[in-house]
Interface confidence: medium
């Protein structure tokens, strides 16, 4: 007799392991045979489907391989056309062992940043993640956490954070573990013993020394006086991640050494420095102190400007003055290309004046600075617009740090020729009266927005200014 | 007639040392700033190394500073450049040239024809 | 250190003119950077044509000559002749990078 269908052992929760095989059993009493569908998550499996083997007339359905993306609701629907059809359903739960998606990979980082080891798992039962220093487990703390994901955070990274890490993840089913992986902790370049200032006698012998450290080892190298060490023998030695470098001088001059300490971080150094001053005890080569002496200009930017073989001040800070002061006005000369006609030949004498001042010779060879009244006459007739373009400039850091000289000079803090005629220079190329304007190109109103003062000739004794330009 | 005639080049292994010279005629030495400058094979221009008329200071190139030492004697009117500790990348024609002034920077009005460095194991 | 950046290569016809550039690759050329411009043909020595921006050196003819323009150093040759094909290169003075003089990579000049 027709008999409706009946599944007599309904589907049961299956768990399985991914690559192995999971079979739903449905049997089902019927008359006449039923037909019998799978299901997975409502979708329904294609008979020809690859992965699945449906046998027994369809009351088993067998994954041949378990992915962990199978898991899911399985349900076998039985039809024979008598009464309705009758359905069970049951669960797959996969089952995986750990397995470490995305390994920890090997990290250098800088003292005192953040370090983030990954470690990224896989598995079910969900696996727990620790972690391995060394041959030891790895214990948090207020600076290392392992976070949810699996990945070990360590803030403010120490020395003694370095070293060889692995994670390990486990479940019921398993354990596993990461390759080991190398956390190098870089350390700025820091200088542990700075080189000492000595004054001595000239032609002696002295040794500065200068200790420094970081990860890597840094490297050393002494400048002397703005340039590379040009004499001098080095001596170094590392030990302990601590290098030690000493250099040896034979002393014919003052100077100021520095020791630099550089090391490599990826694309990028970290330097330290330390600088000491060798000063000579009775320095007293003819025209020579210690800050500088008076020579005759040779050089080949200010020709036009100064007076034939002026006697100008070469300062001894710099290893070489009358290389380092031509360079100094030969890279500011060009910016004056661009100012105004006007404003060109009384910046260029200015500039010049400045940067090689008049030297007064004596036992105490002596700079003479510019007048007053000169600056002014610069700063706020002929340059006024550029005056302010340059002081923004300077105020803004827009000079770089060698051209410091090149700032413009402050006026205010100049000597006015009222004070002492002698103790000031005289911009020669400024020298004019009012009304002989024409040996300069003429402004675009016929009339000048300042007074301008009445600066004396070379020649002449009488000091007499506007009132805009009287120095009390 | 101005001159300047560089020598002391050839064939040196890594780590070895050469002294190149440049002989200067026909201006006054003691004048000019000087400097020497490179060319790799088929390669562009790249300057190295300069001097004042004085040879007070020296300035070099980062990647030869602590290697190569410049230096000058204006009495016999020859230039120098000291290399030392050569690396398979300094092999070029080395060129000495006059600057146009007294200062370590700017144009070069002067050359020599060249001398090869050739750094080879 | 900042790069000196130059076309690689550019041509021109005979009585054409052709300008070659000269930047940098942070910032701008100015008259501070002191442009100089040299001139190489195969198998000889460089010649100074342009100094500081604009001056021609002795014996360079007038169809050569140099400018600032934007941000850039620039060489025009106007009237180019045959004998002009050859390398190019500008040079720059760079101050605050370590007292450096900086060559570009050049510019191969071809006289069509």
């Known amino acids: 007799l027709p008999k409706a269908p009946v599944i007599t052992t309904p589907l049961e929760t299956v768990d399985a392991l991914v690559e192995e095989v999971a079979t739903f059993m449905c049997a089902v009493e019927s008359y006449p045979q039923p037909e019998i569908s799978w299901t997975r998550n409502k979708i329904l499996i294609k008979l020809f489907d690859t992965r699945y083997s449906i046998r027994e007339n369809g009351q088993l359905l067998t994954i041949l391989s378990v992915e962990d993306s199978d898991d899911g609701i399985y349900c076998c629907t039985a039809n024979n056309g008598v009464g309705g059809a009758v359905e069970s359903c049951g669960a797959l739960q996969v089952k995986m062992k750990p397995k470490i998606t995305r390994p920890p990979i090997n990290v250098k980082i800088i003292e005192g940043l953040k370090a983030v080891l990954p470690c990224t798992t896989m598995g079910n039962p969900k696996p727990s993640v620790s972690w391995i220093k060394g041959d030891s487990p790895l214990r948090e703390n207020s600076r290392i956490a392992v976070l949810e994901s699996g990945s070990l955070r360590i803030h403010n990274v120490q020395k003694e954070d370095a070293g060889q890490y692995r994670c390990v993840a486990k479940n019921s089913l398993g354990t596993a573990y990461s390759k080991v992986v190398k956390l190098e902790v870089e350390v700025f370049a820091r200088i542990l013993r700075a080189p000492e200032s000595h004054n001595v006698t000239f032609g002696s012998f002295v040794t500065l020394h200068c200790t420094a450290t970081g990860i890597p080892v840094p490297t050393i190298t002494w400048i002397e006086n703005g340039n590379a060490v040009s004499s001098g023998s080095i001596q170094e030695s590392v030990k302990d991640r601590v290098i030690d470098s000493r250099l040896q001088l034979f002393i014919t001059k003052p100077g100021l050494y520095t020791c630099i300490a550089t090391n490599k971080h990826g694309e990028k150094f970290s330097t330290a420095k330390a600088a000491a001053t060798i000063s000579i005890a009775e320095w007293s080569k003819p025209q020579k102190d210690n800050k500088g002496y008076c020579a005759q200009y040779r050089g080949e930017v200010c020709n036009a400007v100064l007076a034939k073989d002026a006697l100008v001040f070469l300062n001894t800070s710099y290893a070489d003055p009358e290389e380092a002061q031509e360079l100094l006005v030969h890279t500011a000369w060009n910016e004056l290309k661009v100012v105004s006609p006007v404003c060109r030949p009384a910046a260029e004498a200015l500039l010049c004046n400045h940067i090689f001042q008049e030297c007064s010779p004596g036992v105490v060879p002596t700079p003479i600075p510019i007048c007053r009244e000169y600056c002014l006459a610069v700063k706020e007739l002929f340059c006024a617009k550029e005056w302010l373009v340059m002081e923004e400039k300077t105020h803004r850091g827009l000079y770089r740090s060698e051209m410091h000289l090149l700032s413009v000079p402050e006026c205010s803090k100049l000597p006015s020729m009222h004070w002492d005629p002698t103790a000031c220079a005289r911009l020669p190329h400024l020298d004019y009266n009012k009304e002989n304007l024409k040996t300069f190109p003429p402004m675009t109103s016929s009339k000048p927005s300042v007074d301008i003062p009445n600066l004396p000739s070379s020649s002449s004794s009488s000091f007499s200014v506007s009132p805009t330009y009287s120095m009390t | 007639e101005l001159q300047l005639v560089e020598s002391g080049g050839g064939l040196v292994q890594p780590g070895g040392s050469l002294r190149l010279s440049c002989a200067a005629s026909?201006?006054?030495?003691?004048?000019?700033?000087m400097s020497w400058v490179r060319q790799a094979p088929g390669k562009g221009l790249e300057w190295v190394s300069a001097?004042?008329?004085?040879?007070?200071?020296?300035y070099y190139k980062e990647s030869v500073k602590g290697r190569f030492t410049i230096s000058r004697d204006n009495a016999k009117k020859t230039l120098y450049l000291q290399m030392n500790s050569l690396k398979s990348e300094d092999t070029a024609v080395y060129y000495c040239?006059?600057?146009?002034?007294?200062?370590?920077?700017?144009?070069?009005?002067?050359w020599g024809q060249g001398t090869l460095v050739t750094v080879s194991s | 250190q900042a790069v000196v950046t130059q076309e690689p290569s550019l041509s021109v016809s005979p009585g054409g003119t052709v300008t070659l550039t000269c930047g940098l690759s942070?910032?701008?050329?100015?008259?501070?950077?002191?442009p100089d411009w040299y001139q190489q043909t195969p198998g000889q020595a460089p010649r100074g044509l342009i100094y500081?921006?604009?001056s021609r050196h002795s014996g360079v003819p007038s169809r050569f000559s140099g400018s600032i323009s934007g941000n850039k150093a620039a060489l025009t040759i106007t009237g180019a002749q045959p004998e002009d094909e050859a390398d190019y290169y500008c040079?720059?003075?760079?101050?605050?990078?370590?007292?450096?003089?900086?060559f570009g990579g050049g510019t191969k000049l071809t006289v069509l």
């Open positions: 040239a006059k600057r146009s002034g007294r200062i370590a920077f700017g144009a070069l009005d002067a």
């Open positions: 026909g201006f006054t030495f003691d004048d000019y700033g």
């Open positions: 001097i004042p008329w004085n040879g007070g200071s020296t």
């Open positions: 942070s910032g701008s050329v100015t008259a501070s950077n002191y």
């Open positions: 500081s921006t604009d």
């Open positions: 040079a720059l003075y760079m101050y605050s990078d370590s007292k450096l003089y900086v």
